[in-house]
Amino acid sequence: QASLSCDAAGVCDGSSRSFTSIPSGLTANTKKLDLSFNKITYIGHGDLRACVNLRVLTLESSGINTIEGDAFYSLGSLEHLDLSNNHLSSLSSSWFRPLSSLKYLNLMGNPYRTLGETSLFSNLTNLQTLRVGNVDTFSEIRRIDFAGLTSLNELEIQVLSLGNYESRSLQSIRDIYHLTLHLSESAFLLGIFADILSSVRYLELRDTNLARFQFSELSVDEINSPMKKLAFRNADLTDKSFNELLKLLRYILELMEVEFDHCTLNGVGNFNPSESDVVRELGKVETVTIRSLHIPQFYLFYDLSTVYSLLEKVKRITVENSKVFLVPCSFSQHLKSLEFLDLSENLMVEEYLKNSACEGGWPSLQSLVLSQNHLRSIRKTAEILLTLKNLTALDISKNSFQPMPDSCQWPGKMRFLNLSSTGIQAVKTCIPQTLEVLDVSNNNLDSFSLFLPRLQELYISRNKLKTLPEASLFPVLQVMKIRENAISTFSKDQLGSFPKLETLEAGDNHFICSCELLSFILERPALVHVLVDWPDSYLCDSPPRLHGQRLQDARPSVLECHQ
């Protein structure tokens, strides 16, 4: 018989124990109970009666198909209830009536068609997070469903088979910070959108085929929508439906952020927003994020000239993992307010980057991320970016660079440079002297002897250094992370000569636990405040007798130290 393991704090773990019923022996001491991934099927009225102080009850994927009406009557202190992915084909309001303290409720992945015959949640006045719906059977949203709920932090509704949406069903919730809607078709989208305009701050639309979406004027009063963020995840769009979606932005004038994640655009970027709306529609949008956009015809993609004016005020753009190999010069020149650009995981090479970072392109750009592209020459990359007069931060990590030359020309204001995971074997004077932060972690460096007068932070973990770099190279260094190298020791001279060092992370090196090193550590209790990963990451590699022991605990023999 499987048993429940509980600790002194009343946390009981019964996950994946093949329980076929709620285990006995639960007491008022039980604060947290996890019975997920079992075969419980039934919860009777007395099964949880002793758990009067229970705060968290997790019953995810427990095979439950029946819950007695008063099964939760003693759970007045319950704050978190997860009933997701069970076999509950109907829901009862009597389950939830006693749960006046409930803040989190997850009912997703159960085979109900509706949310019951009466308002399930009207007693849950403290509810902050609610997740409902399923992939296939849940098909109707009615006005009674969310009655009584006035304010939620998160509401997630999975309704991929929506057949009917009763107007104003979601309007009763006056304030929703984050609404996630899994909708397979766009048929009811306009109706839902009208109902949530005055309540939702962050709308996330998932798994939706928007190819046939058509805008029509909303019959709403003059609304000052609080919506600040709009996200589309795993959605299908066309050039035409994108134009139609843009029209929704007329109603959310405070919108600041738009995100497209794992979407498919069956088009070539031939967008044609109606001229009158162009300036208005993205009025306050500052951040546009596109991740893993799939464009089957990406080689035919237009230069987006039709939406240039839409993007002139945008400050932050991310286009990640979307097969970008070239940003047209004219497009770059129109991104007049752009301060941050992330083109990670794309196909950029220096020669095409030159076209993008053309004269007058990205005039306000301060941070550029080109991590994991096809860049091959640090010198060429630096030179091409000279046009970016305001560039202070550059991330070119995870590119496979040829050996670094001795000299390179960089934008004059460069303060941050990330060259991690680039396969570099030596650091040369090509690195700009203006840097305040340098990341060269996860490379093949066996030494570092470059003078960087303004450097405040050096990240050099996962390399092959045998000693700490000379302190005189970095007169103002505050942070050094040098984990997972081949450092065998450090001394008073080495550490004492970093006058401003506040943080040193040097764990997981191959320390030789000599008398000198161990006595130095004993003499310097203040080291603990500098070594952030002390003491667990600082282990003796040798001598064999001390192998694996923490430096803090290692004690050399008297003989060894007085030879």
Epitope: K323, F325, L326, E345, E351, N355, H374
Partner: antibody, heavy 118, light 111 residues
Amino acid sequence: QVQLVQSGSELKKPGASVKLSCKASGFTFTTYGINWVRQAPGQGLEWIGWIYPRDGSTNFNENFKDRATITVDTSASTAYMELSSLRSEDTAVYFCARLTGGTFLDYWGQGTTVTVSS
Amino acid sequence: DIVLTQSPATLSLSPGERATLSCRASESVEYYGTSLMQWYQQKPGQPPKLLIFGASNVESGVPDRFSGSGSGTDFTLKISRVEAEDVGMYFCQQSRKLPWTFGGGTKVEIK
């Protein structure tokens, strides 16, 4: 250093299928596209299609769309190209090549000779 | 499909002479300021080797006697002083539109 090593020569009968492999090393396999190109004896080069290992997306020359399948095993850094319903005019050297910058083929495998004959 | 026509079919030169190979596309291969045209060299029994990409960018490790030029539909590969090791077939290739296509090739031989 970057290398693409292809499987050995194949002799096939008309109507059969052939599956060629291309093992990559010296670079992050999922960061680049892998293309397949063939060259019939004494002829020019003909592009078959590509795959992006990161997301598995493929694109084919219409001439091969119904007969060619390109797949990858990212754990083994290997790309595969299967050609079905072989005919004598499929006799050629088949090359895999790394796609850089989305537009050019900067490293090529040594080629696999496929002979289709009854 | 974009058809690439290379000329001449064969180019026979003495060492040190200048070679000019031409590639004409049936439609423009421009993509917003960049010509998506490549040149490859292939020696007998070997795979092709990239020489030039984006019409004029010389691939790393390629001798500087090779240069590429052109835009729109007309492209040229020049070898400033031909050497014995330059013999082989030269192919142009466009990546502006799918399917990607190659020219029929120009054979360079030394007299």
